[in-house]
Interface confidence: low
């Protein structure tokens, strides 16, 4: 293609020289350069007469010679107006003008469809000087034309601030039909009508379309481009293409597969990503989508315990991202999990079931009957409690966490202690005197820390007081106990 101003330049080989005079392109006369003798060269095969009025721009020079003879108007000479040729052939055309010698530095530029053409290797300008005038012949050559070279070409010359423009030369590149719209692959519902479109252009026109289904022609008579094929419905996959014919020959479009939508295949590789006491994170690999996008998926969860009632929990989720966190499960329980996904046609079968387990839970009940004593003789606080009732799924009790907060005159200090699972008492050192100690206890399993007991407060006096009685968890409805010894 010719390189236009403001477009990316494409390199071309230098034109190999004048075409042989006998070469013709699709019966259109080929223009050749004139001989170098004479200042008014004649253009070979020129289809216009020298005396015909010129439609291009004319410049009337204001300058006169020494003898004061007025100079003739300047204009490009007429040349061939229309060239028709096949793709990939070479073409050369020119425009010529005679310019008085008083004008220096005249240049001719080539324009196509209103844009200046850059790339000097396409254009050659030759000068044939004489006593009074110089004949200038500008030749433009294209070694292998393409469809994009179609268009209207003109020469321009600037003299004395005037622009001289030649008549246009129309280049028409003909070739095999060129597809501007080809049929597209589609996924269709079984026995449902759909349309396919095919459009191709020349030149030369007209372009006729034949449709092909699975290697057999669908229409006996061609249709003028563009053509829309209405297929009443399919029961199985088919391949369609279209043939575009013009006087130059035949072009065949790409073959496109028309798939029949079906229910998806079941998901595969359901796997456990993470397990906690009350949730299981699963992922899966979706099966084949049945030529229709997945809409959503369903996670089915059954208790694997043989004594369970066999009920199934169903969790619906979006098809992406193939990941779901199943929540509200029991701790330390076994579950069977399957996944099914749907598209617009329907639901897939359920994936192979996998077995998953939740981990131990944290205790759900706080220790009971928390009692706090001040043992002043050893400067300790003794704590006693009762083991909370634990559910089997809460897991095995591994110990207790004791929080004791010491508050005195704007100071607040919280400490944590740990005791083994067999204990039901603990001893903590007095941290601050003349202060309130608030004690709370939580049971601990491998599943986590349970709720803390209600706070029990005891006042730790200054040194020298007597140990009277314990503080303990209040009975329901009682006020917050603070025992001041």
């Amino acid at each position: 293609a010719i390189t236009e101003a403001r477009e990316e330049a494409k390199p071309y080989p230098l034109f190999p020289g004048p075409f042989p005079g006998s070469l013709q392109t699709d019966h259109t006369p080929l223009l050749s350069l004139p001989h170098a003798s004479g200042y008014q060269p004649a253009l070979m095969f020129s289809p216009t007469q020298p005396g015909r009025p010129h439609t291009g721009n004319v410049a009337i020079p204001q300058v006169t010679s020494v003898e004061s003879k007025p100079l003739p108007p300047l204009a490009f000479k007429h040349t061939v107006g229309h060239i028709i040729l096949s793709e990939h052939k070479g073409v050369k055309f020119n425009c010529s003008i005679s310019v008085p010698n008083i004008y220096q530095d005249t240049t001719i530029s080539w324009w196509k469809d209103g844009k200046e053409l850059l790339g000097a290797h396409h254009a050659i300008t030759q000068f044939y000087p004489d006593d009074e005038v110089t004949a200038i012949i500008a030749s433009f050559s294209i070694t292998s034309v393409q469809r994009s070279d179609n268009g209207s070409y003109i020469c321009k010359m600037k003299i004395n601030n005037e622009e001289i423009v030649s008549d246009p030369i129309y280049i028409e590149v003909q070739g095999l039909p060129h597809f501007t719209k080809q049929p597209e692959s589609m996924n269709v519902t079984r026995n449902t009508a759909f349309n396919l479109t095919c459009q191709a252009v020349g030149p030369p026109e007209p372009v006729n379309i034949f449709w092909v289904q699975n290697s057999s022609r669908v229409n006996e008579q061609p249709e003028k481009s563009p053509s829309v094929l209405t297929v009443p419905g399919l029961t199985e996959m088919a391949v369609f293409s279209c043939e575009a014919h013009n006087d130059k020959g035949l072009t065949v479009s790409k073959g496109v597969q028309i798939n029949i939508k079906a229910i998806p295949s079941p998901p595969t590789e359901v796997s456990i990503r993470n397990s906690t006491a009350h949730s299981i994170l699963i992922s899966w690999v979706p099966g084949f989508d049945g030529y229709s996008p997945f809409r959503n998926c369903s996670i089915q969860v059954k208790e694997a315990d043989p004594l369970s009632n066999g009920s199934v929990m169903i969790f619906n989720t979006s098809a992406l991202p193939h990941l779901y966190q199943i929540k509200q499960l029991q701790a330390l329980a076994n579950y069977s999990i399957g996944v099914s996904c749907m598209n617009e046609i329907g639901w897939s079968a359920v994936s192979p079931w996998i077995l998953a387990s939740t981990t131990e839970g944290a205790p759900s009940v706080a220790p009971l009957n928390v009692t706090v004593f001040l043992n002043e003789s050893s400067d300790n606080v003794d704590i006693r409690w009762m083991k909370p009732p634990t559910k089997q799924q809460d897991g095995e009790l591994v110990g207790y966490r004791i929080s004791h907060v010491w508050q005195s005159a704007g100071i607040s200090k919280e400490l944590l202690e740990e005791v083994g699972q067999n204990g039901s008492r603990a001893r903590i050192s007095v941290q601050v005197h003349n202060a309130t100690c608030t004690v709370r206890i939580a049971a601990v399993t491998r599943g986590g820390v349970g709720p803390f007991s209600d706070p029990v407060k005891i006042f730790i006096p200054a040194h020298g007081w007597v140990d009277y009685a314990p503080s303990s968890t209040p009975a329901p409805g009682n006020a917050d106990p603070v025992l001041i010894i």
């Epitope: 591994v398 110990g399 944590l416 202690e417 986590g448």
Partner: antibody
Framework: QVQLVQSGAEVKKPGASVKVSCKAS????????MHWVRQAPGQGLEWIGV????????NYNQKFRGRVTMTRDTSTSTVYMELSSLRSEDTAVYYC????????????WGQGTLVTVSS | DIQMTQSPSSLSASVGDRVTITCQAS??????VAWYQQKPGKAPKLLIY???NRYTGVPSRFSGSGSGTDFTFTISSLQPEDIATYYC?????????FGQGTKLELK
């Protein structure tokens, strides 16, 4: 005072087994869990497993399951860690560490036992 | 497994500098994070437990904070004897994983 004393360094061939001991003193042996941690040369710390001496509760890191065995002898206040099918990447210093309370931090550590696996 | 991502992996600081190390858990570990100090050829030593509690005898320049997934260990004023490798560790779920360690060097 609390002390955890481990057995001496060992050199083993690939495929062999090694048994490292950790003798506890200065506290009530059955009241504290004992963990095992290893450290390959120039690398970080890696948890192997835990044993509760009071009831022989054991929890192993899945990575070592099938190759590691933890036992305890309450009469000598000693815990043992045996690792079988040794490979060169098992070359490391193996530590026992006492867990304070029943959850969380390791307050006392053994001095470490270097196990070298080399053909 | 719960991953404990510790950063930076190494850092240089001067005596008296404030040094901060972070540890990010791949899922919530509540406050069950401990920080340990290890010097070459020695067993690790406990510094901080339950994310923010200083262990007995540990100098007050060492502190910890955070809960859930993000934890921070700070030395408020670096001393020469603090040059060591520091590790975080979670105890929420077995296997009880450590961070990859932060090697602290003197500038």
């Amino acid at each position: 005072q609390v002390q955890l004393v481990q057995s001496g360094a060992e050199v083993k061939k690939p495929g062999a087994s090694v048994k490292v001991s950790c003798k506890a003193s200065g506290y009530t042996f059955v009241s504290y869990w004992m963990h095992w941690v290893r450290q390959a040369p120039g690398q970080g710390l890696e948890w192997i497993g835990v044993i509760d001496p009071s009831d022989n509760y054991i929890n192993y890191n899945q990575k070592f399951r099938g190759r590691v065995t933890m036992t305890r002898d309450t009469s000598t206040s000693t815990v043992y860690m045996e690792l079988s099918s040794l490979r060169s990447e098992d070359t490391a210093v193996y530590y026992c560490a006492r867990e304070a309370g029943t959850r969380g931090y390791f307050d006392y550590w053994g001095q470490g036992t270097l196990v070298t696996v080399s053909s | 497994d719960i991953q404990m991502t510790q950063s930076p992996s190494s850092l240089s600081a001067s005596v008296g500098d404030r040094v901060t190390i972070t540890c990010q858990a791949s899922q919530s570990v509540s406050n069950t994070v401990a920080w340990y100090q290890q010097k070459p050829g020695k067993a690790p030593k406990l510094l901080i437990y339950y994310a923010s509690n200083r262990y007995t005898g540990v100098p007050s320049r060492f502190s910890g904070s955070g809960s859930g997934t993000d934890f921070t260990f700070t030395i408020s004023s670096l001393q020469p004897e603090d040059i060591a490798t520091y590790y975080c560790r979670q105890d929420t779920r077995s296997p009880f994983t450590f961070g990859q360690g932060t090697k602290l060097e003197l500038k």
